[in-house]
């Protein structure tokens, strides 16, 4: 006998997690067999929709992989033409384990500003968000708060806020942790100890101290009368985010010395400055007819270059001539660290013999200058490129220190060995040998101003030089 459809198993509320299977059952008794249709939120579910599976003549509806958007009211309607259609409805509640959709990222922030670490979450039930700093739960206070969105806001960031953070999203279905991120607190550079001003005698040594701090640790640069310090020795040490810089100066003129501490914050820099003046008591420029005395060389820098027990001229215009001249050489040699292997030994020989000139003892001790030919050999053969660069820097005012100018002879002003062989000094390391003429390296492209000997490259301790003309 025909029988109107009766739903024997009404639809129930189904809870399902995202990506899980969800099944509604609508068991129907009727004769003949009914047509069963399904709706979601009153919209018909198409039987060919591959996201759904229908079994047992439509009595079982399965969502094969639940999505967030599947949430809603599902109804089955059974109709077999006998009596009216019957309907049963049930809800699908899409539950979702917590998911962090916008995790926190590493942040660098300047002390005193506001930091926000994002942590946006999804989940059903709505997850609660907490934060962990290091290994401990983070406590909220007047500066630190977890926003409704889950993000962490820190007002007036302090150094102690730096560290590792992660957010935790929790609901009844589970817990999600973000990756660990770093909050780095940067601090503007500031000077803790400024250099002190000094009034000293000409030729004195002065050490200027400058101490600075910041995060990251700042770098310290020294400025002399508005230009980068080109002479003097700088010693630096860093401890516990504090940098200590000491500038040792050989004073030949007054000046304003500025310590500049700089650190970088992203694309921007922060700087702090402190200045000190160096004045010279009864200062006047050193005269050309400086007096001095002969003494054996007792320094270290020119040991390998000057003849053993060589008598050198020590200039008494310096308070401590030996130390002052040694510092001049030392400073000049530091600049030679970057020159070519061909140039360096020749330049070292020239510098040492120029600053510690050979001394002619007598009633009036007299310095013997280097012969012009040797100076030109260094300038235009061994160190042609380097000399051009150095002269260019001098003209551009990059070498303001008189110490530097003192360390480089002007070849054209030196006496020639042709005028009076005893009036000028030869460089002992440039030993002339006519047989080596064919072994010289090619001359530089710049044409020499005078005939100069072609000198082959050699080790730092010995040169063989073949003249293009007689030097005897």
């Amino acid at each position: 006998l025909p029988k109107a459809p009766v739903i024997t198993t009404p639809l129930e509320t189904v809870d399902a997690l995202v990506e899980e299977v969800a099944t509604f059952m609508c068991a129907v008794e009727s004769y003949p067999q009914p047509e069963i249709s399904w709706t979601r939120n009153k919209i018909l579910i198409k039987l060919f929709d591959t996201r759904y599976s229908i079994r047992e003549n439509g009595q079982l509806l399965t969502i094969l992989s639940v999505e967030d958007s599947d949430d809603g009211i599902y109804c089955c309607t059974a109709n077999n033409g006998v009596g009216g259609a019957v309907e049963s409805c049930g809800a699908l509640q899409v539950k979702m384990k917590p998911k962090i959709t916008r995790p926190p990222i590493n942040v660098k922030i300047i002390e005193g500003l506001k930091a926000v670490l994002p942590c946006t979450t999804m989940g059903n039930p709505k997850p609660s968000v907490s934060w962990i700093k290091g290994d401990s739960p983070l406590r909220e206070n007047s500066r630190i708060a977890v926003l409704e969105s889950g993000s962490l806001r820190i007002h007036n960031v302090q150094k102690e806020d730096a560290g590792q953070y992660r957010c935790v999203a929790k609901n009844s279905l589970g817990t999600a942790y973000s990756k660990v991120v770093k909050l780095e607190v940067e601090v503007f550079a500031r000077i803790l100890r400024a250099p002190e001003s000094h009034n000293v005698t000409f030729g004195s040594f002065v050490t200027l101290h400058c101490t600075a701090t910041g995060i990251p640790v700042p770098t310290i640069t020294w400025i002399e009368n508005g230009n980068a310090v080109s002479s003097g020795s700088i010693q630096e040490s860093v401890k516990d985010r504090v940098i200590d810089s000491r500038l040792q100066l050989f004073i030949t003129k007054p000046g304003l010395y500025t310590c500049i501490a700089t650190n970088k914050h992203g694309e921007k820099f922060s700087t702090a400055k402190a200045a000190a003046t160096i004045s010279i008591a009864e200062w006047s420029k050193p005269q050309k007819d400086n007096k001095g005395y002969c003494a054996q060389y007792r320094g270290e820098v020119c040991n390998a270059v000057l003849a053993k027990d060589a008598l050198v001229f020590l200039n008494t215009s310096y308070a401590d001539p030996e130390e002052a001249q040694e510092l001049l050489v030392h400073t000049a040699w530091n600049e030679l660290k970057v020159v070519s292997p061909v140039c360096r030994p020749a330049a070292e020989a020239l510098l040492c013999n120029h600053i510690f000139q050979e001394c002619s003892p007598g009633v009036v001790p007299t310095p013997i200058p280097i012969c012009r030919e040797y100076c030109l050999a260094v300038k235009e053969l061994f160190c042609a490129k380097e000399w051009l660069v150095m002269e260019e820097k001098t003209h551009r005012g990059l070498y303001r220190s008189e110490m530097h100018l003192l360390s480089v002879p002007e070849c054209s002003k030196l006496p020639s060995m042709h005028w009076d062989p005893t009036a000028c000094a030869r460089l002992p390391h440039l030993d002339y040998n006519k047989e080596n003429l064919k072994t010289f390296p090619p001359m530089t492209s710049s044409k020499p101003s005078v005939d100069i000997p072609n000198l082959p490259s050699s080790s730092s301790s010995s040169f063989s030089v073949s003249p293009t003309y007689s030097m005897t």
Epitope: T9, E12, V14, D15, A16, L17, E20, V21, T23, M25, A27, S53, I54, R55, E56, N57, Q59, L60, T62, L64
Partner: antibody, heavy 121, light 107 residues
Amino acid sequence: EVQLVESGGGLVKPGGSLRLSCAASGFTFSSYTMDWVRQAPGKGLEWVSSIGSNGDYIYYADSVRGRFTISRDNAKNSLYLQMNSLRPDDTADYYCARGQLAVAGTHFDYWGRGSLVTVSS
Amino acid sequence: DIQMTQSPSSLSASVGDRVTISCRASQKVNKYVNWYQQTPGKAPRLLIYAASTLQSGVPSRFSGSGSGANFTLTISGLQPEDFAIYFCQQSYSPLCTFGQGTKLEIK
């Protein structure tokens, strides 16, 4: 009395084909979902395929999809499983089972005795 | 696919004992779980369907319980014919799956 009898099993080389049949009696065949379940020697049960009472809703396990085809002939009260591209791991006893809708899902209330399929070179 | 995990994989018991076999689904499956018994050389036999309904003709010493993802088959007062392999199965998904089986042996 409900009866399900499988046939068509045997020895086949890898890559070969076989067609299993299941003859049903003792119930209204056209009113029930029918399934194939297999059991490798000494192993557990593995569901293979399912077909709705009218032959409209068909499902396969991932391991056989694309190689096996389930079908039915309600007029002959018969269920079939066409097996192509057979592999050694298809070696098993193949059972046909009747699906029954209950208050919570379906279950297999009647099973055949099984038909052994051996895939070996 | 929904995975069904049975425990233990085997257990020894004596006639008259009460034993329980557990089955855990990889997701909630409502009550769409069935239990089967298989003795050597025979086809499986339905014991329990819809988690707790006893199939007709099955002795009442067999009972099933559970809902969601955790299910249990209990045999109270083991009989010699009960020593067999037991399988759980879910039908919540159209791609139904079985547990790996629990072998019940005589101690």
